[in-house]
């Protein structure tokens, strides 16, 4: 049986259930490479608690469908009266990285996992020439989740004070320039991850071959090196590579950009001080708050619930988006489809469009920037599920009572952008981490 | 106050059985991971079983197909049924409760003799 997601195969990914202190191990082509939980095992579970292993999911008893891997085993479970077995079920979502798999729950004798990524979308475009895992557990299985800084198009320019050069990099995939072809970016080579610009020629000096990798807490490391055994003149006989180190910086603060820190013979060393080289647990909520000594903020945007039916309207050209965020209630252009965005057309207000749900809402705060998030909404033709991204800024003088209004500001591939404007995305720091 | 409390350990002959109970008081229950331990005279402690807060249940290779771990969150306890005992599950048998939020909670431990 051929392999569901071939460009999944190369790995083996992590998973955790954090309340109970377990680490699953996935392959979901072959087996994971763990001899306690036997030879065959394409889920390992791993309890930190009693230090014990079982596999719950055997990769030859394997079963897939476009959106579903279901992979049985021979353990029974204690479903009494029945024949029951352990079994894990993995459902796939078209997202716009290769993603990780999120542990869901588990019962007697299913564990669930979901999985956004690239690899189950129904049309190609968001697919990279090359891409690797982008997070990492801790030691206290915390997450680390670089998947927010990918470039779907473009690069980022790094810090260097070399006027004859510019070296761009993405974040655990190569630069896509046919999406977004800036004119220094045109040049480089296809696959590369690190491109380096000398006046009208791109070099490639460096591709994602292995995963993101945690050296200390707060300290994640990506490295690329070049494929191609053809060397490059002003390299003096070395082949290139790039080391890229992500450090969560001690406290709060704004964004910095990738410094260069070292560079010799083609080796380039990167320094990047980024909050989401921290534990998500630090930067992100599923409420409408972020606040404790774990987040060292005070946010609460639940303010901006609109109750009574009414909504925020945000006009987008051919579309009005009907907003209500940081609640459940229903829109009512949205009449059950538990739309936290409602998309309607203007030229037909027949045709409406969940482009995020209220239960699928995430709350993050990184590097100065306030945004929420609803996905999970209705299909486009790639088979993404629509989302939106609302990018909130601090203004204490906003109007509608200190509430102000979304902004729409664009579409990318079914991803709908707003700014807002409101007293409530003034961050109230501790200082404390 | 954060308690476990187990009970219904006893002496019974080689291939009887018997129910334990832990009963647990100041936690929400159902949040919890419950484990079950055990400990022979002049050995270490050693896992037996565990019941997550979702339901998914583990076993030692020691007990499996003859042990049961459950629980009733309406009492707040959980239960280990033992069948087919053997002369080497005589121990103390001790429940634990964990979470992310409370460091792990011990109980008292019950004594288990399997002899004839």
């Known amino acids: 049986q051929a392999a569901p997601f071939p460009e999944l195969c190369s790995y083996t990914w992590e998973a955790v259930d954090t309340k109970n202190n377990v680490l699953y191990k996935i392959n979901i082509c072959g087996s994971v490479d763990i001899v306690q939980c036997g030879p065959s095992s394409a889920v390992c579970m791993h309890d930190l608690k009693t230090r014990t292993y079982h596999s719950v999911g055997d990769s030859v008893l394997r079963s897939a469908t476009r959106s579903l891997l279901e992979f049985n085993t021979t353990v029974s479970c204690d479903q009494q009266g029945t024949n029951h077995r352990v079994q894990s079920s993995i459902a796939f979502l078209c997202g716009k990285t290769l993603g990780t798999p999120e542990f869901v729950t588990a019962t007697e004798c299913v564990h669930y996992f979901e999985w956004r990524t690239t690899a189950a979308c129904k049309k190609d475009i968001f697919k990279a020439n090359k891409e690797v895992p982008c997070y990492v557990f801790d030691e206290e299985l915390r997450k680390h989740d670089l998947n927010p800084l990918i470039k779907l198009s473009g690069a980022y320019l790094v810090d260097d004070s070399d006027p004859d050069t510019s070296l761009f990099i993405n974040v655990c995939r190569d630069i896509d320039t046919l999406r977004d072809p800036g004119s220094q970016l045109r040049a480089c080579p296809p696959g590369t991850a690190a491109c380096l610009v000398r006046g009208h020629q791109a070099f490639d000096v460096g591709q994602p071959r292995d995963g993101l990798k945690v050296v200390r807490k707060d300290r994640l490391v990506l490295s690329y090196v070049r494929e191609e055994a053809g060397k490059l003149d002003f390299c003096d006989g070395h082949s290139p590579a790039v080391t890229i180190t992500f450090v969560c910086p001690s406290e709060r603060r704004e964004g910095t950009i990738p410094k260069l820190t070292a560079k010799s013979n083609c080796r380039y060393e990167i320094e990047w001080i980024t909050e989401y080289a921290c534990h998500r647990d630090y930067l992100e909520s599923k409420t409408c708050s972020l606040s404790g000594e774990q987040q060292d903020v005070s946010i609460d945007l639940t303010p901006l619930a609109q109750s009574g039916g009414s909504s925020y309207i945000s006009d987008g050209k051919e579309y009005l988006f009907y907003l209500n965020v940081c609640g459940e209630t229903e829109i009512q252009f949205c009449n059950k489809k538990q739309a936290a965005v409602c998309q309607v057309k203007k030229s037909d207000t027949s045709q409406v469009k969940a482009a995020g749900r209220y239960h699928n809402q995430t709350l993050r705060y990184s590097d100065g920037d306030l945004t929420l998030i609803y996905f999970g909404g209705d299909e486009c033709s790639s088979g993404f599920q629509r989302m939106s991204v609302i990018n909130f800024r601090c203004n204490k003088t906003a109007g509608n009572d200190g509430k102000g209004t979304p902004v729409f500001t664009g579409e990318v591939d079914c991803t709908y952008f707003f700014t807002w404007d409101t007293e409530y995305a003034c961050v109230h720091h501790h200082h404390h981490h | 106050q954060v308690q476990l409390q187990e009970s219904g350990g006893g002496l019974v002959q080689p291939g009887g059985s018997l129910r334990l109970s832990c009963a647990a008081s100041?936690?929400?229950?159902?949040?919890?991971?419950m484990d079950w331990y055990r400990q022979a005279p002049g050995k270490q402690r050693e896992w037996v079983a565990t019941?997550?807060?979702?339901?998914?249940?583990t076993y030692a290779d020691s007990v499996k197909g003859r042990f049961t771990i459950s629980r009733d969150n309406t009492k707040n306890t959980v239960y280990l049924r033992m069948n087919s005992l053997k002369p080497e599950d005589t121990a103390v048998y001790y429940c634990?409760?964990?979470?992310?939020?409370?460091?792990?909670?011990w109980g008292q431990g019950t004594q288990v003799t399997v002899s004839s």
């Open positions: 634990k409760a964990s979470s992310p939020v409370l460091n792990d909670i």
């Open positions: 100041g936690i929400i229950f159902s949040d919890n991971r």
């Open positions: 019941l997550a807060s979702y339901g998914w249940k």
